[in-house]
C-alpha cells in the first residue's frame, strides 16, 4: 500500500504526494492515510427549521 | 468495536523510565496516525506525540523532545511511549488517540476519535 | 508552534441556553480546528472536525463555525449533560495543538 514519504520528521516532511483512492494526505502527518468519505446532507425541505449538520461516512474498520 | 486500552503507567522516580502501550483493537494502527496527549492534574490537554501508520515518521512536543520516543508494532497493533529522564511535570494521565481522516478533496479533515481510558503517570521521589 | 486561545476560560450558563465559545488561532489553520468535550475522569470526546463538520453520534444542538484564525463552537440550547469543559485544536501544522479549555458550569 503507498502511504507518503516515510523518512522525515513531521515538521520537514515535503509537499503532498498522490494516494491511493482509498486514502488522502494528512497534512499533520505528511502522510496519506486511510479516509472514510465526507458527505453533506441533502438540503432540508423548505420550512424546516435549521440547516442539517454536515456528517460523514465512518472508515472502513 | 473500536477500542484503545493503555497500560503501563504508575508511580516512578525523577529521573526514571517507564513504557507506555496502547492496544488497539477493532481497527489496524497501521491505517491511522496515533497519538498520545497528556493531562496533567487540573490542567489542560497538552499533545505530546505521534506516529504515522508506517511507524516511519514521528513529532514530539518540545517539552518531551530528546526524551520520550513513540513507536508503533503493527504485528501486536500496538503504539508505545517510552519515557525517559522523567521529571516531576510530566506527571499527568497519559491518553492514546487515534486520529480519524475523511477525504475533502484529497486532504484529511479530521480528529482524535477513539480515545483510551488514561494511565497515570505519577513522578515523585 | 501555533497557539490556539479561547475564549471565555469558563462559563455558568442554565438549561436551554444559547452557548458561544471561541478558539483563536495565532496563524491561519484554514478549517483544521476540532472541537472535544470532556467530562471529569473521563477522556475527551471529539465533537466537530474540519471547523464544521459534525462527528457521528454527536446532538445536532453542537454546531461549529470558522475558518482563518476565528472558530466558535455553539450548543443551541443546553442540556444538563452538556456542563463539561471543551477543548480547541488545530491540526494544520505539526505540532497539533490544544486552546486551554472552557469549563461551562450550571449557573
Known amino acids: 500500500m503507498r502511504r507518503g514519504p516515510r523518512s522525515l520528521r513531521g515538521r520537514d516532511a515535503p509537499a503532498p504526494t498522490p494516494c491511493v483512492p482509498a486514502e488522502c494526505f494528512d497534512l499533520l502527518v505528511r502522510h496519506c492515510v486511510a479516509c472514510g468519505l465526507l458527505r453533506t446532507p441533502r438540503p432540508k425541505p423548505a420550512g424546516a427549521s435549521s440547516p442539517a449538520p454536515r456528517t460523514a461516512l465512518q472508515p472502513q474498520e | 468495536e473500536v477500542q484503545l486500552v493503555e497500560s503501563g503507567g504508575g508511580l516512578v522516580q525523577p529521573g526514571g523510565s517507564l513504557r507506555l502501550s496502547c492496544a488497539a483493537s477493532?481497527?489496524?494502527?497501521?491505517?491511522?496516525?496515533i497519538h498520545w496527549v497528556r493531562q496533567a492534574p487540573g490542567k489542560g490537554l497538552e499533545w505530546v506525540a505521534w506516529v504515522t501508520p508506517s511507524g516511519g515518521s514521528t513529532d514530539y512536543a518540545d517539552s518531551v523532545k530528546g526524551r520520550f520516543t513513540i513507536s508503533a508494532d503493527t504485528s501486536k497493533n500496538t503504539a508505545y511511549l517510552q519515557m525517559n529522564s522523567l521529571r516531576a511535570e510530566d506527571t499527568a494521565v497519559y491518553y492514546c488517540?487515534?486520529?480519524?481522516?475523511?477525504?475533502?478533496?484529497?486532504?484529511?479533515?479530521?480528529?482524535?476519535?477513539?480515545w483510551g481510558q488514561g494511565t497515570l503517570v505519577t513522578v515523585s521521589s | 508552534d501555533i497557539q490556539m486561545t479561547q475564549s471565555p476560560s469558563s462559563l455558568s450558563a442554565s438549561v436551554g441556553d444559547r452557548v458561544t465559545i471561541t478558539c483563536r488561532a495565532s496563524q491561519d489553520v484554514s478549517t483544521a480546528v476540532a472541537w472535544y468535550q470532556q467530562k471529569p475522569g473521563k477522556a475527551p470526546k471529539l465533537l466537530i472536525y474540519s471547523a464544521s463538520f459534525l462527528y457521528s453520534g454527536v446532538p445536532s444542538r453542537f454546531s461549529g463555525s470558522g475558518s482563518g484564525t476565528d472558530f466558535t463552537l455553539t450548543i443551541s440550547s443546553l442540556q444538563p449533560e452538556d456542563f463539561a469543559t471543551y477543548y480547541c485544536q488545530q491540526s494544520r501544522i505539526s505540532p497539533p495543538t490544544f486552546g486551554q479549555g472552557t469549563k461551562v458550569e450550571i449557573k
Open positions: 488517540a487515534r486520529r480519524v481522516c475523511y477525504n475533502r478533496l484529497g486532504v484529511c479533515a479530521g480528529g482524535m476519535d477513539y
Open positions: 477493532g481497527f489496524t494502527i497501521s491505517s491511522n496516525s
